[in-house]
Amino acid sequence: GQNITARIGEPLVLSCKGAPKKPPQQLEWKLNTGRTEAWKVLSPQGGPWDSVARILPNGSLLLPATGIVDEGTFRCRATNRRGKEVKSNYRVRVYQIPGKPEIVDPASELTASVPNKVGTCVSEGSYPAGTLSWHLDGKLLIPDGKETLVKEETRRHPETGLFTLRSELTVIPTQGGTHPTFSCSFSLGLPRRRPLNTAPIQLRVREPGPPEGIQLLVEPEGGIVAPGGTVTLTCAISAQPPPQVHWIKDGAPLPLAPSPVLLLPEVGHEDEGTYSCVATHPSHGPQESPPVSIRVTETGDEGPAEGSVGESGLGTLA
């Protein structure tokens, strides 16, 4: 038999070998496809199946617009002018080339020694599903599950039967200062079909480096608060990826889950003390912020406070 590939929506003509080019012809076409359960013999007079597969005057079979359900086997049996029976057998596969793949949500830069999501490659409207591959500086990237991680997802459209592929690439660059170029390609896996490539993205890799500084911000400013007030401490750090932040009060670690923000609601005198935050970065040691002092003072002790009498001499309630 002969293997045929036809593009979805395009016509396909299968010739019936041995059939006389003009009537009278002795021939029979039968098909076994997604539209049939077993073999369907087509009527030479034509009929409802003509919209899918029609016998032409020369004995060939025309599929006016091939679809996924037309994949299957087509056979013709003809008697030639000399009375000899000639058989033709075709195995038909269909395909659809998707739109050009795209890298969506690309990273703006990468950080060495830590996992970085490069982006997600998306291909829409293929049949069969095909495959997505990532390339680094023009060379195929083989996922190893450690330095190079690829998360794939394939979805099929319930009506069209066409596939959407998504491939998310995560890498751990070994060193900074480089500018790797990533691209993604889609391949249907059919002979004589070149892969479709995305536009490449070039990313800067920077060393994780010690954070440029760690700051501890306090609200209210100055760290002076009335009893029952709220204090917010924020550990501001410029490192990527964000490090884990722990808190220290009067030299002792606070038993709290790591968080860049420490909230002290309804403060009392027991909350007074010196606070600092410690940022722990995967590739560098812990880094401690300069300390800040929190003081809880009764109204009037340290100048105006909530509900205090201001310069105007009038009582104001915030």
Epitope: R35, T36, E37, K40, S43, Q45, G46, G47, P48, W49, D50, S51, V52, R54
Partner: antibody, heavy 119, light 107 residues
Amino acid sequence: EVQLVESGGGLVQPGGSLRLSCAASGFTFNNYWMTWVRQAPGKGLEWVASIDNSGDNTYYPDSVKDRFTISRDNAKNSLYLQMNSLRAEDTAVYYCARGGDILDSLPYWGQGTLVTVSS
Amino acid sequence: DIQMTQSPSSLSASVGDRVTITCRASQDVGIYVNWFQQKPGKAPRRLIYRATNLADGVPSRFSGSRSGTDFTLTISSLQPEDFATYYCLEFDEHPLTFGGGTKVEIK
């Protein structure tokens, strides 16, 4: 909304001719086969004719072959049935329906037009 | 030509009854059978297409099944608006052939 509206029915003498029309709207007419089905008074449904989307291929049962001709004008979104050599047994309500092939099997029908063949 | 033998030709039933109508094809027609409902003075309305698929807007009490060349339309719980005539149609080969019809009447 798909709409099919038949016209052209009426009283005709045996041996006479009549041309039925069907105006289609609400779908891309030239993408679909079209079919005529009839129903004699108090009787069941009978297929009369089908035509493919291009109009190049037509199909008839033996009962009307060589007497009836189905045609279409895709530019006008119209379907026609030319009926010649009419007989008393052709008396029926004639329905126009979309489809008639294995891809689109008569999902939409017109309201019908009555043809009476009588002397 | 393919014959579609529909049975029964008529039946009487009450609201809430389960009703079954059968069509037998004289040869293999695959899945290419539809069911239609017709009320007096109205055009037929497609209920089931390709043997088992419910057409848009048709209540789920209607269902179609197939066993070889036998096709069945079932109304699980007959409603007042279901009293009508039902036809099967074979559209696998020309001539397209309808069953003779089944008139469902109020008992």
